[in-house]
């Protein structure tokens, strides 16, 4: 999906009002210096591309974050403020339902959410280019 045509300011507002708090809740009890950020993003479409991929792609040691509150709110924000996003996600959602597993917060998931926080912070930088 090409995130170029999203309403970035609306997504930023959704992040600041709720998603950021959910990320903090998920990371509660973890020191902010515990994990090194190894990925970043260039402009706002790039940030959303990486946020979407990191939030919804299973990775080694962290099978799924998709059912977490911050992930569901991220998905909702993208669906509302990125034209055509919902249609591109139908097949992915159906596949995810088949794979659904018990939620387990591993250290790898905490590290992944720490990376997500960094990507969201970068997305919100005032000087970051729209595209």
């Amino acid at each position: 999906y090409d995130f170029t045509n999203c309403d970035f300011e609306k997504i930023k507002a959704a992040y600041l009002s709720t998603i950021s708090k959910d990320l903090i809740t998920y990371m509660s009890g973890t020191k902010s210096t515990e994990f090194n950020n190894t990925v970043s993003c260039s402009n706002r479409p790039h940030c959303l591309t990486e946020i979407q991929s990191l939030t919804f792609n299973p990775t080694a040691g962290c099978a799924s974050l998709a059912k977490e509150m911050f992930a569901m709110k991220t998905k909702a924000a993208l669906a509302i403020w990125c034209p055509g996003y919902s249609e591109t996600q139908i097949n992915a959602t159906q596949a995810m339902k088949k794979r659904r597993k018990r939620k387990v917060t591993t250290n790898k998931c905490l590290e992944q959410v720490s990376q997500l926080q960094g990507l969201w912070r970068r997305f919100n930088r005032p000087l970051l280019k729209q595209q």
Epitope: V39, S40, S42
Partner: antibody, heavy 117, light 108 residues
Framework: QVQLQESGPGLVKPSETLSLTCTVS?????????WSWIRQPPGKGLEWIGY???????SYNPSLKSRVTISVDTSKNQFSLKLSSVTAADTAVYYC??????????WGQGTLVTVSS | EIVLTQSPATLSLSPGERATLSCRAS??????LAWYQQKPGQAPRLLIY???SRATGIPARFSGSGSGTDFTLTISSLEPEDFAVYYC??????????FGQGTKVEIK
């Protein structure tokens, strides 16, 4: 300390597919960062080809996108480049590099690929 | 596509002298700029990122400055091992990251 090493054929015929592999040691490619390819034609400047992140997102240089595939084999701690329909203009030293998806902090030593019949 | 123009193409200096290399972007890249050093037959090495932050292990004689469209890499006092080609790279314009054409710093 992370080390990267490119490998693959040094000579490829025009219209064929160039295939290179980068073997990473000292760091698990599924643990973090992005893994990138960059090339440098003889005596010229650098050109970014693309990257694959540790969580699977892929990004390519638009000028090469139609011909490029980057993939990863976590079991071997390797990532690969395929460039199809090559011409003499694809003759270059090809580097693999670790990236934070912005800039490139560790590089392989490079491998020269010549496109010639 | 953002074009990076480096100047001069070649800089002839003696060890101990100060080197000032320029990189100009065709449009603003904020501070999203890196500098690399490349010696003959070797891979590039990251020197500076975010326009002015030194990469790990880079000596303090290397410094970067600038924002927007005009950037400078300064080597305060050239050591023999500093004679090489230097490239700038912008990462403001994903997915079109681009490099400058390079500045060669040679021994006078």
């Amino acid at each position: 300390q992370v080390q990267l090493q490119e490998s693959g054929p040094g000579l490829v015929k025009p219209s064929e597919t160039l295939s290179l592999t980068c073997t990473v040691s000292g760091y698990s490619i599924s643990s973090g960062y992005g893994w990138s390819w960059i090339r440098q034609p003889p005596g010229k400047g650098l050109e970014w080809i693309g990257y694959i992140s540790y969580y699977g997102s892929i990004s390519y240089n638009p000028s090469l996108k139609s011909r490029v595939t980057i993939s990863v084999d976590t079991s071997k701690n390797q990532f690969s480049l395929k460039l199809s329909s090559v011409t003499a203009a694809d003759t270059a030293v090809y580097y693999c590099a670790r990236t934070n998806l912005l800039y490139f902090d560790s590089w392989g030593q490079g491998t020269l690929v010549t496109v010639s019949s | 596509e953002i074009v990076l123009t480096q100047s001069p193409a070649t800089l002839s200096l003696s060890p101990g002298e100060r080197a000032t290399l320029s990189c100009r972007a065709s449009q603003s890249v904020s501070n999203n700029l890196a500098w690399y050093q490349q010696k003959p037959g070797q891979a590039p090495r990251l020197l500076i990122y975010d326009a002015s932050s030194r990469a790990t292990g880079i000596p303090a004689r290397f410094s970067g400055s600038g924002s927007g469209t005009d950037f400078t890499l300064t080597i305060s006092s050239l050591e023999p091992e500093d004679f090489a080609v230097y490239y700038c790279q912008q990462y403001s314009d994903w997915p079109q990251y681009t490099f400058g054409q390079g500045t060669k710093v040679e021994i006078k």
